[in-house]
């Protein structure tokens, strides 16, 4: 069995299959790494485009395991970012191993937007609520923010009345359908026995990319009773 | 009540545009949801597009989804139909249409106050 002693120069293996994945705005690194004979630790950094004097900041040092959250190390989140991994071994170090870039905005999933649907009077009032993400460990919603570009820009909201689908647009820049909490969306109530179902996304701006779209919520309306 | 006058109609080719107005005056305009409707000869009134108080929520008949883009200027008291990709099967009068509160409606009876319509003729 070789010891580290023995390992030459550049005899450290590199981390491979660097990847960065995104939830609600958290990215966390992965890589995967050979099994050797002493437990490797690893160091990864994480380099921010369009940050002044930009260089590579530590984000975990010396780690066991083959995952570093670096949603502390993110900038704006819709400017690029690069990550590199490290392994040493004794006093020994590998080479880095580089990500792809990658922006959370555009590359990151964002979770679907809670939903509320009731009955008021003559009609149905939809809220739509902003799903909540975390940045720099802050948690907040990703409602319209004009110093950034990363923000939902439009719901497409989907009724479902009776068996045919109806999609709403609704702008979150406009103040009257929209606040920093939620969005609002009200449809008359047909005189009918209805049953309405509702489900909605969220698109980002710039990138056009999608929130998970949201479950369906229904309601059943009764000669003007109410069965949620 | 808002009275509203419809213009912008006309004859026009297939694959042309076309660009609706309708002027809203004798009550406050931003306190109404507007809608587009549209009667082709023979057929019932058809709900084509409608907008929210604010300008910020649309919904479109799937019959011209992608081709028509409804909006509004609460500033001059005037909706919009900017309709393109034109069709002879959207060869109607077209409406438009008031409803006061915030729900948006899909159906005539849902709106209370109407224009007299525009005529729109899309040759092939």
């Known amino acids: 069995e070789m010891g580290t002693a023995d390992l030459g120069p550049s005899s450290v293996p590199t981390p491979t299959n660097v990847t960065i994945e995104s939830y609600n705005m958290n990215p966390i690194v992965y890589w995967e790494y050979q099994i050797m004979p002493q437990v490797p630790v690893f160091t990864v950094e994480v380099k921010n485009y369009g940050v002044k004097n930009s260089e590579w900041i530590d984000a975990c040092i010396n780690i066991s395991h083959h995952y570093c959250n670096i949603s502390d190390h993110v900038g704006d989140p819709s400017n690029s970012l690069w990550v590199r991994v490290k392994a040493r071994v004794g006093q020994k170090e590998s080479a880095y191993a580089k990500s792809e870039e990658f922006a959370v905005c555009r590359d990151g999933k964002i979770g679907p937007p809670k939903l509320d649907i009731r009955k008021e009077e003559k009609q149905i009032m939809i809220d739509i609520f902003h799903p909540s993400v975390f940045v720099n460990g802050d948690e907040q919603e990703v409602d319209y923010d004009p110093e950034t570009t990363c923000y939902i820009r439009v719901y497409n909201v989907y009724v479902r009345m009776n068996g045919s689908e109806i999609q709403y647009k609704i702008l979150t820049q406009k103040e009257d359908d929209c606040d920093e909490i939620q969005c609002q969306l009200a449809i008359p109530v047909s005189s009918l026995n209805s049953q309405y179902c509702v489900s909605a996304e969220g698109v980002l701006h710039v990138w056009g990319v999608t929130t998970e779209k949201s479950k369906e919520v229904c309601i059943t309306i009764f000669n003007s009773s109410i069965k949620g | 009540e808002v009275q509203l006058v419809e213009s912008g109609g006309g004859l026009v080719q297939a694959g042309g545009s076309l660009r609706l107005s309708c002027a809203a005056s004798?009550?406050?305009?931003?306190?109404?949801?507007m809608g587009w409707f549209r009667q082709a000869p023979g057929k019932e009134r058809e709900f084509v597009a409608a907008?929210?108080?604010?300008?910020?929520?649309?919904t479109y008949a799937d019959s011209v989804k992608g081709r028509f883009d409804i909006s509004r200027d609460n500033g001059k008291n005037t909706l919009f139909l900017q309709m393109n990709s034109l069709i002879p099967e959207d060869t109607a009068a077209y409406y438009c249409?008031?409803?006061?509160?915030?729900?948006?409606?899909?159906?005539?009876?849902?709106?209370?106050?109407w224009g007299q319509g525009t005529l729109v003729t899309v040759s092939s």
């Open positions: 004798g009550s406050t305009f931003s306190t109404y949801v």
């Open positions: 907008i929210s108080r604010s300008g910020g929520t649309t």
């Open positions: 249409a008031a409803r006061a509160g915030p729900a948006i409606g899909r159906t005539a009876n849902d709106y209370h106050s």
